[in-house]
């Protein structure tokens, strides 16, 4: 009866050689796609000269297959019932699922020019940098191909900078041939309610990016959760993409290929200002851009990106405060298209379908010593791109799942 099913589930979700969970965990059977939409700036000269609103037009999707590589360096630790691993990164362009090629060009913010005065705040350094920006014929905006923008290009301005810095710039540079981790997660052998929960990341239990409890690594990596998920449970997970732990709450019941799943959604509350959600006070790390921590819907992850002025938000500034989106024209936030959700099968805790949506933005501020930025009259959080990473259990896998799990329970 139920006890037998529960016993079987508890056995099969453990992350060790021979279990159903382990096989799928090592290399996901789900095809995962990452779609990109690039924000093409329509009025670059007007912005640079007159500090006008930035007019953007999204272009996409440009689709890549990701997460197709198996976890590596898998090491079980029987002492503390954990398993450690790294997740290799790789992306393969999918032309048939894209509106164009990787060579398509876009007008976007010049990442190096925008970041330089933010990283080097000394006035004289900025005078030096300005001379190099001019020498390299760089300006506030640049035209780059999709491939360059995502995966990296040699920046002409940075190539002249005499400091020992990387001269290659790209939103996801470096990506291919890199790994995420080391992750160390509980295998659930001694306590099934801890299965897949992250014990440490890169050898640490905290991130060193945020003050107080915001710095904690909570929950799993969202690919699975401890079994027997209840609607009342808050699912906590860590996302290295956004350099923080976050949570999802129950939204609705869904039928996914005949499998009853719970759709958990990221609530607006997770992106709220400390004014609306006091728990978020430690995610507000600076007072100026955040208007004394009253702005919401954007997360400054600069500390996690070597001091670069990178801000993460939901696509089209969904759930963001009006002051954030006001300087940008052409954004159309939409809950259905732009929210993140996880469809979790409640008995096993496996995520059978998901859509992770996020937007990468760069802060650019007026800089009186940088000619390319001296006419700006206000700071802008400039959207560069947004992505939709999705995965759905395959038909075959779904049938197998129904037979082995949900069918038996019915």
């Amino acid at each position: 009866g139920d006890m037998l099913i529960e016993k079987t589930i508890k056995r099969e979700v453990v992350l060790e050689e021979g279990t159903t969970a382990f096989k799928n965990w090592v290399k996901t059977g789900t095809t995962v796609y990452r779609q990109f939409w690039i924000f093409d700036v329509q009025n670059p000269d007007d912005v640079a000269k007159n500090s006008s609103k930035i007019k953007v037009k999204q272009r996409g999707p440009y689709t890549y297959r990701v997460r197709y590589l198996a976890k590596e360096n898998i090491t079980q630790d029987p002492e503390d019932h954990t398993v450690s691993f790294v997740q290799p990164n790789g992306a393969i362009f999918e032309p048939s699922l894209s509106v164009g090629t990787e060579d398509d060009n876009f007008t976007v913010l010049n990442l190096a020019v925008a970041a330089a005065p933010h990283i080097y705040q000394n006035s004289f350094v900025q005078v030096v940098l300005n001379s190099l920006i001019k020498k390299s014929k760089s300006s506030m905006f640049q035209t780059r191909s999709l491939k360059e923008l995502l995966w990296g290009y040699k920046d002409p301005f940075l190539s002249l900078v005499p400091y020992p810095i990387s001269t290659t710039v790209g939103v996801f540079y470096p990506y291919n041939d890199t790994v995420d981790g080391v992750y160390k997660v509980f295998n659930g052998k001694d306590n099934i309610s801890k299965v897949a929960i992250i014990e440490s990341y890169k050898g640490k239990r905290n991130l060193s990016y945020w003050p107080s409890y915001c710095d904690m690594i909570n929950g799993t990596d969202a690919a699975s959760f401890p079994p027997f998920v209840e609607k009342s449970r808050t699912l906590r997970f860590f996302s290295s993409d956004i350099c923080r732990s976050i949570y999802a709450v129950f939204g609705s019941e869904i039928d996914l290929k005949g499998i009853p799943v719970y759709r958990f959604v990221l609530p607006a509350n997770a992106f709220a200002s400390p004014l609306q959600n006091p728990d978020n006070h430690c995610f507000c790390t600076e007072k100026v851009i955040s208007n004394n921590c009253t702005s919401y819907g954007v997360l400054d992850i600069g500390k996690c990106k070597e001091g670069k002025p990178v801000y993460i938000s939901l696509p089209h500034f969904l759930h963001a405060s009006p002051d954030v989106s006001e300087p940008i024209e052409g954004l159309h936030p939409n809950e259905d298209e732009h929210r993140t959700y996880l469809d979790v099968e409640p008995i096993t805790g496996f995520t059978l379908q998901f859509a992770k949506r996020l937007q990468v933005n760069i802060l650019v501020k007026p800089a009186r010593k940088i000619e390319a930025l001296k006419n700006l009259k206000r700071p802008y959080i400039v959207p560069i791109l947004w992505l939709n990473e999705t995965g759905t259990i395959g038909d075959e896998k779904a049938e197998m799942f129904k037979t082995q799990v949900t069918g038996k329970i019915k």
Epitope: N122, S123, F124, V125, V127, V128, N130, S131, P162, Y163, R368, K369, K374
Partner: antibody
Framework: QVQLQQSGAELVMPGASVKMSCKAS????????MHWVKQRPGQGLEWIGA????????SYNQKFKGKATLTVDESSSTAYMQLSSLTSEDSAVYYC??????????????WGQGTLVTVSA | ETTVTQSPASLSMAIGEKVTIRCITS??????MNWYQQKPGEPPKLLIS???TLRPGVPSRFSSSGYGTDFVFTIDNMLSEDVADYYC?????????FGSGTKLEIK
């Protein structure tokens, strides 16, 4: 208070080199760049270049590249300037100077007393 | 390189008179102009920094104006202690360049 103490006057032969010093006190030496400025007798001022005291990165006026070499010794909070292949044109008072960063930048807010270099056979 | 042309080269004024010195730059430097006073045997002293900002402790009779390429330095009521050489410095771009100086004397 901020003080920049420069080394004494130098009388040098044409073709020779000279190295002068600028010892800083009253502030954290590596927090500020050090500039050097030339003033020929009865004439105007010329910016020679500057050095980042924290990592020894230098920025020179093209006119003085090959003539002046800027260095620092963090342990003694001292900046140095060496002038090579001296000619009578190099006879001048040389100043070290430091900026002040507040709400706006004050360039060369603090100056050393100057080192007089005389090039003569 | 931005050239800074300073005028006049010398100026003889009576105590209490208004003194005006002008600097013209070869390129647009916004308001990145600075003004220095140098007395004999001393290093220069910064009076006014970028943005026409009077430095702390500098008497209010000193002022400056200008933007772009044309800049003016003014002493409202000249005192005997104001006898000195005055220099402008553009700090917009490298290399920083000074004006050739103005020698202010008492008439």
């Amino acid at each position: 208070q901020v003080q920049l103490q420069q080394s004494g006057a130098e009388l040098v032969m044409p073709g020779a080199s000279v190295k002068m010093s600028c010892k800083a006190s009253g502030y954290t030496f590596t927090d500020y760049w050090m500039h050097w400025v030339k003033q020929r007798p009865g004439q105007g001022l010329e910016w020679i270049g500057a050095i980042d005291t924290s990592d020894s990165y230098t920025s020179y006026n093209q006119k003085f590249k090959g003539k002046a070499t800027l260095t620092v010794d963090e342990s003694s909070s001292t900046a140095y300037m060496q002038l090579s292949s001296l000619t009578s044109e190099d006879s001048a008072v040389y100043y070290c100077a430091r900026d002040y960063y507040g709400s706006s930048t004050a360039w060369f807010a603090y100056w050393g007393q100057g080192t007089l270099v005389t090039v003569s056979a | 390189e931005t050239t800074v042309t300073q005028s006049p080269a010398s100026l003889s004024m009576a105590i209490g008179e208004k003194v005006t010195i002008r600097c013209i730059t070869s390129t647009d430097i916004d308001d990145d102009m600075n003004w220095y006073q140098q007395k004999p045997g001393e290093p220069p002293k910064l009076l006014i920094s970028e943005g026409n900002t009077l430095r702390p402790g500098v008497p209010s009779r000193f002022s400056s104006s200008g933007y772009g390429t044309d800049f003016v330095f003014t002493i409202d009521n000249m005192l005997s202690e104001d006898v000195a050489d005055y220099y402008c410095l553009q700090s917009d771009n490298l290399p920083f360049t000074f004006g050739s100086g103005t020698k202010l004397e008492i008439k």
